[in-house]
């Protein structure tokens, strides 16, 4: 738990943090990456399997600046955006390259954040204000979740080994607020 849904100035919901990997390597300055990667596990069975471990989705890497009020991070942070439809892991790398996409005949799968990492950022402020620091929570990996047809489109059913944590509020008094996705900068980043 820990980093539960934080409301930022753009009312974006960022889900709580579960386990997360080692801190990222030093960020590359002034370089924007938009790279699709295979975010899933390698397949061991035919792709008719209902095991979510056989599915994979795209992880797009973006660098962006974190803003907080009038302040902006000294360096951009690199984060993942989970994108695209899920398909069997063995097909995805080729499918991305050839412009094809596997479409399941059964339930829809969706690519969503799986793990998060925290990163300290130094914020530079205008008007001679002293720099300030905060910790931002960034997506570290993506996973596939199945969209059940019996529920509202926004409800996702998790087949992963780690159950998705509910979109709670911040720590002691959990509650979620409305979400606005994909803003260009991580406004307040939490």
């Amino acid at each position: 738990q820990g980093w539960q849904a934080f409301k930022n100035d753009a009312t974006e919901i960022i889900p709580e943090l579960g386990e997360y990997p080692e801190p990222p390597p030093e960020l590359e300055n002034n370089k924007t990456m938009n790279r699709a990667e295979n975010g899933g596990r390698p397949p061991h069975h035919p792709f008719e399997t209902k095991d979510v471990s056989e599915y994979s989705c795209r992880e797009l890497h973006f660098t962006r600046y974190v803003t907080d009020g009038p302040c902006r991070s000294a360096k951009p942070v690199t984060e993942l955006v989970c994108s695209g439809q899920c398909g069997p892991a063995r097909l995805l790398p080729n499918a991305i390259g050839r412009g094809k996409w596997w479409r399941p005949s059964g339930p829809d799968f969706r690519c969503i954040p799986d793990r998060y990492r925290a990163q300290r950022v130094q914020l530079l402020c205008p008007g001679g204000e002293a720099p300030r620091a905060r910790k931002v929570r960034l997506v570290a990996s993506c996973k596939c979740k199945r969209l059940t047809r019996f529920h509202n489109q926004s409800e996702l059913k998790d087949f992963g080994t780690e159950a998705a944590r509910p979109q709670k509020g911040r720590k002691p008094r959990p509650r979620a607020r409305s979400a606005k996705a994909n803003q260009a900068e991580l406004e307040n980043a939490y």
Epitope: A118, G127, K135, K171, Y190
Partner: antibody, heavy 118, light 107 residues
Framework: EVQLQQSGAELVRSGASVKLSCTAS????????MHWVKQRPEQGLEWIGW????????EYAPKFQGKATMTADTSSNTAYLQLSSLTSEDTAVYYC???????????WGQGTTVTVSS | DIQMNQSPSSLSASLGDTITITCHAT??????LSWYQQKPGNIPTLLIY???NLHTGVPSRFSGSGSGTGFTLTISSLQSEDIATYYC?????????FGGGTKLELK
């Protein structure tokens, strides 16, 4: 459930030192700045300082430099506040806080009462 | 140090009232103002950060406004659970400082 659990009340002699602990559960203290705030009986709140448990960086209010020492142990997910050369002025409730930023305090522990006797 | 002057120091109001607490900083603190609520015998909790951002789980009857040196906390339609002492805090520069508190009581 996310909690900041602080150590129990302390009754200490004037001139002595005391070390307070604040153990986090439900989150990793490395992901936050850990702050300490003092509240004297029937008085307001005073910020003591913050520590970044990830690297040990600290910032103290000038008033508490030399009086307070903040440390953190990430393996036990615990932040500590040591107060030295205690006087009656140090009798207070001490709160630990977890903050996403250095400049406000998201979550508060239940407080530790320190009573300094002469 | 930046001083935070809170007024009034105490306030009596009736359920359903709209109440306003003000906080004045002795120098410009931009948007870096937070509000905390401390119920009797309890711990402080964050209500509002960065002038007007509600901490998650805080009811929408709480709102904050202001900039520079003058800031306001407004509680519309006062509820019994809002009886508490309210503190402002500046996060503009070290050392961070709190207002003296406003004790809100029921009439």
């Amino acid at each position: 459930e996310v909690q900041l659990q602080q150590s129990g009340a302390e009754l200490v002699r004037s001139g002595a030192s005391v070390k307070l602990s604040c153990t986090a559960s439900g989150f990793n203290i490395k992901d936050y700045f850990m702050h300490w705030v003092k509240q004297r009986p029937e008085q307001g709140l005073e910020w003591i300082g913050w520590i970044d448990p990830e690297n040990g960086d600290t910032e103290y209010a000038p008033k508490f430099q030399g009086k307070a020492t903040m440390t953190a142990d990430t393996s036990s997910n615990t932040a500590y506040l040591q107060l030295s050369s205690l006087t009656s002025e140090d009798t207070a409730v001490y709160y630990c806080n977890a903050g996403q930023a250095t400049y406000y305090f998201d979550y508060w522990g239940q407080g530790t009462t320190v009573t300094v006797s002469s | 140090d930046i001083q935070m002057n809170q007024s009034p120091s105490s306030l009596s109001a009736s359920l359903g009232d709209t109440i306003t607490i003000t906080c004045h900083a002795t120098q410009n603190i931009n948007v870096w103002l937070s509000w905390y609520q401390q119920k009797p015998g309890n711990i402080p909790t964050l209500l509002i950060y960065k002038t007007s951002n509600l901490h998650t789980g805080v009811p929408s009857r709480f709102s904050g406004s202001g900039s520079g040196t003058g800031f306001t906390l407004t509680i519309s339609s006062l509820q019994s659970e809002d009886i508490a002492t309210y503190y402002c805090q500046q996060g503009q520069s070290f050392p961070y400082t709190f207002g003296g508190g406003t004790k809100l009581e029921l009439k």
